[in-house]
């Protein structure tokens, strides 16, 4: 999906109002220094591409974050503010929901969510630069 036509201001507002709180709740008990940020992004569409990938694409040691509250809210936000997102992406993520057997917050998942927080911060910084 090409995130170029998204309403970035509205995505930022949703992130600051609600998604960020759920990401921080998920990370509770860990320190910001516990993980190194290895994933980066260069502009707003690129940041959303990386956020989409890290949130919804399963990785070997963190099967899927797609059922987490922050992921559901991310999906809703992208569906609302990125025209055409739902048609291309939602069905693709339904299968990932089923892949998730039990709710175990592994260290690898915490690391992945830490990367997500970094990507969202970068998304907001690139937004501020543009204004």
């Amino acid at each position: 999906y090409d995130f170029t036509n998204c309403d970035f201001q509205k995505i930022e507002a949703d992130y600051l109002r609600t998604i960020s709180k759920d990401l921080i709740t998920y990370m509770s008990g860990t320190k910001s220094t516990d993980f190194n940020n290895t994933v980066s992004c260069s502009n707003r569409p690129h940041c959303l591409t990386e956020i989409q990938s890290l949130t919804f694409n399963p990785t070997p040691r963190c099967a899927s974050l797609a059922k987490e509250m922050f992921a559901r809210k991310t999906k809703a936000t992208l569906a609302l503010w990125c025209p055409g997102y739902s048609e291309t992406q939602i069905n693709a993520t339904q299968a990932m929901k089923k892949a998730r057997k039990s709710k175990v917050t592994t260290n690898k998942c915490l690391e992945q969510v830490s990367q997500l927080l970094g990507l969202w911060r970068r998304f907001i910084r690139t937004l501020l630069k543009k204004q």
């Epitope: 509205k10 809703a76 936000t77 609302l80 503010w81 025209p83």
Partner: antibody, heavy 120, light 111 residues
Framework: QVQLVQSGAEVKKPGSSVKVSCKAS????????INWVRQAPGQGLEWLGV????????IYAEKFQGRVTITADTSTSTAYMELSSLRSEDTAVYYC?????????????WGQGTLVTVSS | QSALTQPPSASGSPGQSVTISCSGS?????????VSWYQQHPGKAPKLMIY???KRPSGVPDRFSGSKSGNTASLTVSGLQAEDEADYYC???????????FGGGTKLTVL
């Protein structure tokens, strides 16, 4: 079963406000969009706005900006539509309608409608 | 942004086909594949008949079909039946600001 049940008919004076409720049952309320659509007597459908409780987003039709407020109480699975500064032209049947989960722009479930009459 | 444009009336005899048009712009119908059609019988709430231009919800007869060309969407009812007599409304997503637009409605009469 899966349904939207709206509050009863209202008669209001010009200049006052009306608040219509829409109680959802049989589905996960927060994930869907709850839209409000009205229909004046003998007229077509007119979209007022939508709320997506999951992310707390509301979008209003430009025509009603500043006059309509849509809220939701996820604990009771109820959405509300308040219209202020009522005038006779606001006399209509007001419907709540469910916008599909993540596909908020089509309405697959409708309430029974609430008749709001504005008259002095 | 104004409402989508529909003919006020359409008619056909039982068994015939009738097509209702819905004209918009590149900002709504032409810009997205997010057109819906609703059927409304007198005194009843509207019912979703077609969504995303041409998809039918379960329970809607396959006599109802939707299509789109440029800025105009169409609803075709084939093999007209008496119970198809109703008002039909088109609707389109219209971007993140306007969000939803409705057509003025078409009264379908089965002769």
């Amino acid at each position: 079963q899966v349904q939207l049940v709206q509050s009863g008919a209202e008669v209001k004076k010009p200049g006052s406000s009306v608040k219509v409720s829409c109680k959802a049952s049989g589905f996960t309320f927060g994930s869907y969009g709850i839209n409000w659509v009205r229909q004046a007597p003998g007229q077509g459908l007119e979209w007022l706005g939508v709320i997506v409780p999951l992310v707390g987003v509301t979008i209003y039709a430009e025509k009603f900006q500043g006059r309509v407020t849509i809220t939701a109480d996820t604990s009771t699975s109820t959405a509300y539509m308040e219209l202020s500064s009522l005038r006779s032209e606001d006399t209509a049947v007001y419907y709540c309608a469910r916008g599909q989960e993540y596909f908020y722009w089509y309405f697959d479930l409708w309430g029974q409608g609430t008749l709001v009459t504005v008259s002095s | 942004q104004s409402a989508l444009t529909q003919p006020p009336s359409a008619s056909g005899s039982p068994g015939q086909s009738v097509t209702i048009s819905c004209s918009g712009s590149s900002s709504d119908i032409g810009g997205y594949n997010r057109v819906s059609w609703y059927q409304q019988h007198p005194g009843k709430a509207p019912k979703l008949m077609i969504y995303d231009v041409s998809k039918r919800p379960s329970g809607v007869p396959d006599r109802f079909s939707g299509s789109k060309s440029g800025n105009t969407a169409s609803l075709t009812v084939s093999g007209l039946q008496a119970e198809d007599e109703a008002d039909y409304y088109c609707s389109s997503y219209a971007g993140t600001d306007t969000f939803i637009l409705f057509g003025g409605g078409t009264k379908l009469t089965v002769l």
